[in-house]
Structures are given as C-alpha cells and as structure tokens.
C-alpha cells in the first residue's frame, strides 16, 4: 500500500513538473528536452549552456541554455538565434 | 545603401486579409532579421513578431497569433505579413524593420510604413 | 510579457533644454534595452541600443545609461528636430514589448 502511495505521489510530481515547466524547460540535468522554447532568448540573459544529443539517452538534440533566472530553456540548435549565442558563449570562454 | 522598400495603402473591409510586402536591398538578407511593428492612430509602437529570412523561423506576439502569417521570398530579397480576420482596431501604419544581433539585437533600418485603414 | 513603462508621457522643453527621459521594466532586463524616435509620418529611427550605445549617425547630445529595471535616456541640449516622440524597447525575450511613448513638445 506504502509503495503504491509514493508511486502515485511520484508520478504525480513527475506530471506537475511537467506542466510547470513545459517541453521548453529541462527540470534539472537529467531531464531531456522534449521540445524547443519558441522565444527568442538574448546573448545578454544567458550565462552558459549545455548540448543534448539525441544519441546520448534524449529523443532529440537540443541546446539546454542557462539563464540568469535559474531557469533551463530548450533550444533548436538549427535555429540562427541559437548558433549565434553558442557562438557568442563558445568565443567568451576561449577568450577565458 | 540598406533599404527596406514596403507595398502601397490598402483598405479593406472587416474579416477580410491584407499582405502587406517588404523588399531588402543593400545588405545580405538572411544574415538579418525581419520584424513587424505597427502604430494605430494615437498609440504607440506594437511588436508583432519576427521572422529569420534564412531558416523562415518566425515567433509571434501572443495578441496576433493564430491571425498573422509572415512569409519570406529568398529570391526577392523580399518578406511578407499577411493579417487576416481584419477588424477596425487593425487600422494602422504597418513598419518592417531589420533586426540586427550585432547591434543588440535592435531594429536599425525601417521600412516607411503602410497604411492598412479597416473599413466598411 | 516584460511590461515597460515611460515617464513623462510627455514633456514640454525649449531649445537649449537637457531633458530626460525614464523607462521602467517589469523585470530585470540586463541591459537588453534600445530607444527608438519617432516623428510625425516618419519611420522611427534607432538612437541607442544594449542601453547606453550610440548608433550609427546620432548626435552625441543623446545619450542613455542604466541598468537591471530602469533606463535612462538623456538629451544634454535639445535642438529643434528633437521635437519628436521617444519610445523604449525591450529585447531581452520575444515578445520585444515597447514602452507607452514620450512626447517632447516645444515649450
């Protein structure tokens, strides 16, 4: 009875942070990006990111960006905006 | 020298669409953005959305969305945004402009504007 | 979406004037602000982006500074083709939603 409760509990949590954080919004590191923001994020709002191959455990490839909010936000690594920041972020820390 | 050459006046009634174009010369077209900025009569400027000519990856004011469509024409050099379901609110001056990452993503060459009047 | 807000939303000066305009954000928006001008029947013209840069063209009486919610832009000596309306905008994340307008009228 104990482990069907925290099943339900956990699948129950699992669906909420679904919804809070949309397929846009990886939860934590170890969640896969579902589906890409459909926003446009500035160079300025962003202090890293990290890939996510489709390869690797994850259904598609995606760039994971770190905002200054915390927040992680799913991106199309094909979309110009996108390679533009990896660009902008890949430069800064070669020039590090 | 960059230009941004947009289509004439239109009227139309209420519930009809409007396309109003946008053509680019001077510059690479698909290295830059193209925006939508409309002013009605004694309002201020209004974003509605934007579109990457190299990729045709558009993102949309939540206010427009389901009811604008921009479009882009490579070989023209050439972007469209097209209106639909038109009603009076929707008179207005309608500006294209580049947006530029290299300026802070700023809109800094305007179209001079098209005048969409709503009426029955 | 970042809501900006203007003040004045309009301003009565003379030639000669150092006037300022403010720009308030809902949120934080780092910097990822440009000011934009605006006269009658015209296109508006960029003046300042990412905050405080100068763009191509535009006298150095124009100037803009702040940072995290609230902007500034500054004209040290209004001229008379300043008489216009100012308008600010956010670009930190779609949709680049523009402050309400300031109208600088002549006094």
């Known amino acids: 009875m104990c482990c069907t409760k925290s099943l339900l509990l956990a699948a129950l949590m699992s669906v909420l942070l679904l919804h809070l954080c949309g397929e846009s919004e990886a939860a934590s590191n170890f969640d896969c990006c579902l589906g890409y923001t459909d926003r446009i994020l500035h160079p300025k709002f962003i202090v890293g990111f990290t890939r996510q191959l489709a390869n690797e455990g994850c259904d598609i490839n995606a760039i994971i960006f770190h905002t200054k909010k915390k927040l992680s936000v799913c991106a199309n690594p094909k979309q110009t905006w996108v390679k533009y920041i990896v660009r902008l972020l890949s430069k800064k820390v070669k020039n590090m | 020298q960059v230009q941004l050459v947009q289509s004439g006046a239109e009227v139309k009634k209420p519930g009809a669409s409007v396309k109003v174009s946008c053509k680019a010369s001077?510059?690479?077209?698909?290295?830059?953005?193209m925006h939508w900025v409309r002013q009605a009569p004694g309002q201020g400027l209004e974003w509605m959305g934007v579109?990457?000519?190299?990729?045709?990856?558009?993102t949309y004011a939540q206010k427009f969305q389901g009811r604008v469509t921009m479009t882009v024409d490579t070989s023209t050099s050439t972007v469209y945004m097209e209106l639909s379901s038109l009603r009076s609110e929707d008179t207005a001056v309608y500006y294209c402009?580049?947006?530029?990452?290299?300026?802070?993503?700023?809109?800094?060459?305007w179209g001079q504007g098209t005048l969409v009047t709503v009426s029955s | 979406d970042i809501q900006m807000t203007q003040s004045p939303s309009s301003l009565s000066a003379s030639v000669g004037d150092r006037v300022t305009i403010t720009c308030g954000a809902s949120?934080?928006?780092?910097?990822?602000l440009n000011w934009y001008q605006r006269k009658p029947g015209k296109a508006p013209k960029l003046l300042i982006y990412?905050?405080?840069n100068l763009a191509d063209g535009v006298p150095s009486r124009f100037s803009g500074s702040g940072s995290g919610r609230d902007y500034t832009l500054t004209i040290s000596s209004l001229q008379p083709e300043d008489f216009a309306t100012y308008y600010c905008?956010?670009?930190?994340?779609?949709?680049?939603?523009f402050g309400q307008g300031t109208k600088l009228e002549i006094k």
């Open positions: 402009a580049r947006g530029n990452y290299g300026v802070d993503y700023a809109m800094d060459y």
């Open positions: 001077g510059y690479t077209f698909t290295n830059y953005w």
């Open positions: 579109i990457d000519p190299s990729d045709s990856y558009t």
């Open positions: 949120e934080n928006i780092y910097g990822a």
């Open positions: 990412g905050a405080t």
């Open positions: 905008q956010n670009v930190l994340i779609t949709p680049y939603t």
